[in-house]
């Protein structure tokens, strides 16, 4: 039956991809989509993309928002399109912050799997406020 779609591997979703690591693409495909916001040198850094490997996003997606970084993950085609990660409010805004969209991204490839994906690792999401 042509309509039958056996599950031989985890479901993949189309995700919005925004940032330097996305190259010329505005989307990627993965087992989870994400939208993140981090603070880097006082700038708000917004990123969107996908985790091709589920385990890659597992810890990152479970990490609660901190003053310097927040990640929201979802599963579903284009589910991160209308998601904007929010930093936890502390009653006042961070001094001197500006919104700079799609800044300071790194391309993380899954070497073990030979990937050419628009991926971001937990380390990368924390990269900005560790510096």
């Amino acid at each position: 039956m042509e309509d039958e779609k056996p599950k031989v591997n985890p479901k993949l979703y189309m995700c919005v991809c925004e940032g330097l690591s996305c190259g010329n693409e505005d989307h990627c495909e993965g087992q989870q989509c994400f939208s993140s916001l981090s603070i880097n040198d006082g700038f708000h850094v917004y990123q969107k993309g996908c985790f091709q490997v589920y385990e890659q996003g597992k810890m990152t997606c479970k990490t609660p928002p901190s003053p310097g970084q927040a990640v929201e993950c979802c599963q579903g085609d284009w589910c991160n399109r209308n998601i904007t990660a929010q930093l936890p409010t502390k009653g006042k805004s961070f001094p001197g912050t500006q919104n700079f969209h799609l800044e300071e991204q790194k391309l993380i490839s899954e070497e073990d799997l030979g990937g050419e994906q628009k991926l971001i690792s937990e380390e990368d999401l924390h990269h900005h406020h560790h510096h």
Epitope: K5, P6, K7, V8, L12, C17, E29, L113, Q117, K118
Partner: antibody, heavy 114, light 113 residues
Framework: QVQLVESGGGLVKPGGSLRLSCAAS????????MSWIRQAPGKGLEWVSY????????YYADSVKGRFTISRDNAKNSLNLQMSSLRAEDTAVYFC???????WGQGTLVTVSS | KIVLTQTPLSSPVTLGQPASISCRSS???????????LSWLHQRPGQPPRLLIY???NRLSGVPDRFSGSGAGTDFTLKISRVEAEDVGVYYC??????????FGGGTKVEIK
Amino acid sequence: QVQLVESGGGLVKPGGSLRLSCAASGFTFSDYYMSWIRQAPGKGLEWVSYISRTGSTKYYADSVKGRFTISRDNAKNSLNLQMSSLRAEDTAVYFCAREPLQHWGQGTLVTVSS
Amino acid sequence: KIVLTQTPLSSPVTLGQPASISCRSSQSLVHSDGDTYLSWLHQRPGQPPRLLIYTISNRLSGVPDRFSGSGAGTDFTLKISRVEAEDVGVYYCMQGTQFPALTFGGGTKVEIK
């Protein structure tokens, strides 16, 4: 009905290059990710490479990484595998397969020998 | 990388008799989403492989009910209740849990005695 037809196989010297193609018909090509899987003579199956529906995501087995490049042309319903720096151990029948490995082509034989 | 080990390498069977193939994984194939992506394929000589069973025990439509899959975690079994002539060939287990890095077992050849 779903049809996948591979072409481009042949005899090539070690270090040489070859480009395999897979012509797809009978389904909406752009709705499915595609894979190349190979089988050395008398041996088992080995996954080689994968490409997502739009071609934005590509993955390779360690054994071919840096030497093989997968691509697709959704307008032409075609899948390609550019193979370079070929080695004797790349000798195999190469199958293209459609998600979720429910449909396979008949394969094309690549022989790497001097 | 997940390694799948199949036993036996070869299984000579009498027509109408049962056959059983084992597939052992080097690590659990239970995915974080709860599913276990272990499939079985059958390859007749000179033909491409054909998917028979997915997620351990689900038969593809058109696959005879004499084929059944079972197991959990790292140990899986394909059983043919009564082998018919058309069942000869090589059977492979395959894991998709670590997708996109699919891996296959080494294969088990089923032949008629």
